[in-house]
Amino acid sequence: ELCDDDPPKITHATFKAVAYKEGTMLNCECKRGFRRIKSGSPYMLCTGNSSHSSWDNQCQCTSSAARNTTKQVTPQPEEQKERKTTEMQSQMQLADQVSLPGHCREPPPWENEATERIYHFVVGQTVYYQCVQGYRALHRGPAESVCKMTHGKTRWTQPQLICTGETEPSQFPGEEEPQASPDGLPESETSR
């Protein structure tokens, strides 16, 4: 079942999932000037059987200006730089993920995707928080939130994290180095 609301917002922190439970949906959002192709699915869905989970459907964006074409527009230098960073981040995320049964890994980027990813999480999902660049973590407990449910009532637990002052960002589970991204990682992790 889907979680009714978003994971909690922590000031000066971002969250990400190390892996996504089956049933999770990721909106196929495109950056400004692009739109989802007409025949394209509105979302990707994490599905699987007992041995393997993967994302169903692929997101595809096309130029809003171009009519009835799926031809991709070559990114401008600034866009290429931004895409490289996102690709690098995704590769790093993939590298530090262990295959969990019943879970999908972070989907790779698609061309001209929006900067912000919008996930629809399911009950039982855990997300992990880290402070953005320039803030350090004060932990009172785990910097994570779990979507739990009792008979239709869903709620995210409150992560025990405060981000304060100046220093390197804290790390997500499985990451050895703090991320180089100026906004911390992921730059865009949100849910519906």
Epitope: E1, V123, H151
Partner: antibody
Framework: EVQLQQSGAELVRPGASVKLSCTAS????????VHWVKQRPEQGLEWIGY????????EYASKFLGKATITADTSSNTAYLQLSSLTSEGTAVYYC????????????WGLGTLVTVSA | DVLMTQTPLSLPVSLGDQASISCRSS???????????LEWYLQKPGQSPKLLIY???NRFSGVPDRFSGSGSGTDFTLKISRVEAEDLGVYYC?????????FGGGTKLEIK
């Protein structure tokens, strides 16, 4: 292994109070809801209420309002049921149970605590 | 409160027979989110209850496929295709759609 360990049997006088405990092992109660269920001798099951240990929110069946109080201590991974002003109607086995994280149903049960109210 | 009525109160069966238990709610138990939180629990003598079926027809992990649940709205049924000795005990239906959540009175499955 996921388990709920409940406190031992209690013999209490009419009008007195008793506090039962339910300690979880193998999981963090903060990430769950803990419920209490009553079963009188040779009778059926009655849902008393639940607590969200993460924030202390509780919900009770109306017949147990003012009679039962559910609390939790996340540091010891324990939930409690306090029963007050007990009468012979309070003689029962009290079970704690938690939801399966993914399904939200009563998947894990303690073995129960027998409370006997007698003069 | 939603009243859950189970029939029969007692169900004598022979091992290998099919058993069917009915549960009727006093009002629709469709939750506001569209799901129906109707569950079946088995309590064996001297033990805690155990979850068998959730959301009307979904078997909980480890529950044998001889158990099946069906129904909608206010009428629900638990079927055991071939009764085994380990299935004996008291079966309870439960609704978790409307607070206060309520159990049925129980059906005792026993050897004929």
């Amino acid at each position: 292994e996921v388990q709920l360990q409940q406190s031992g049997a209690e013999l209490v006088r009419p009008g007195a109070s008793v506090k039962l405990s339910c300690t979880a092992s193998g999981f963090n109660i903060k990430n769950d809801y803990v419920h209490w269920v009553k079963q009188r001798p040779e009778q059926g099951l009655e849902w008393i209420g639940y607590i969200d240990p993460d924030n202390g929110d509780t919900e009770y069946a109306s017949k147990f309002l003012g009679k039962a109080t559910i609390t939790a201590d996340t540091s010891s991974n324990t939930a409690y049921l306090q029963l007050s002003s007990l009468t012979s109607e309070g003689t029962a086995v009290y079970y704690c149970t938690t939801d399966d994280t993914s399904y939200g149903m009563f998947a894990c049960w303690g073995l129960g605590t027998l409370v006997t109210v007698s003069a | 409160d939603v009243l859950m009525t189970q029939t029969p109160l007692s169900l004598p069966v022979s091992l290998g027979d099919q058993a069917s238990i009915s549960c009727r709610s006093s009002q629709s138990i469709v939750h506001s989110n569209g799901n129906t939180y109707l569950e079946w629990y088995l309590q064996k003598p001297g033990q805690s209850p155990k979850l068998l079926i959730y959301k009307v027809s979904n078997r909980f992990s480890g529950v044998p496929d001889r158990f099946s649940g069906s129904g909608s709205g206010t009428d629900f049924t638990l079927k055991i295709s071939r009764v085994e000795a380990e299935d004996l005990g008291v079966y309870y239906c439960f609704q978790g759609s409307h607070v206060p959540w309520t159990f049925g009175g129980g059906t005792k499955l026993e050897i004929k």
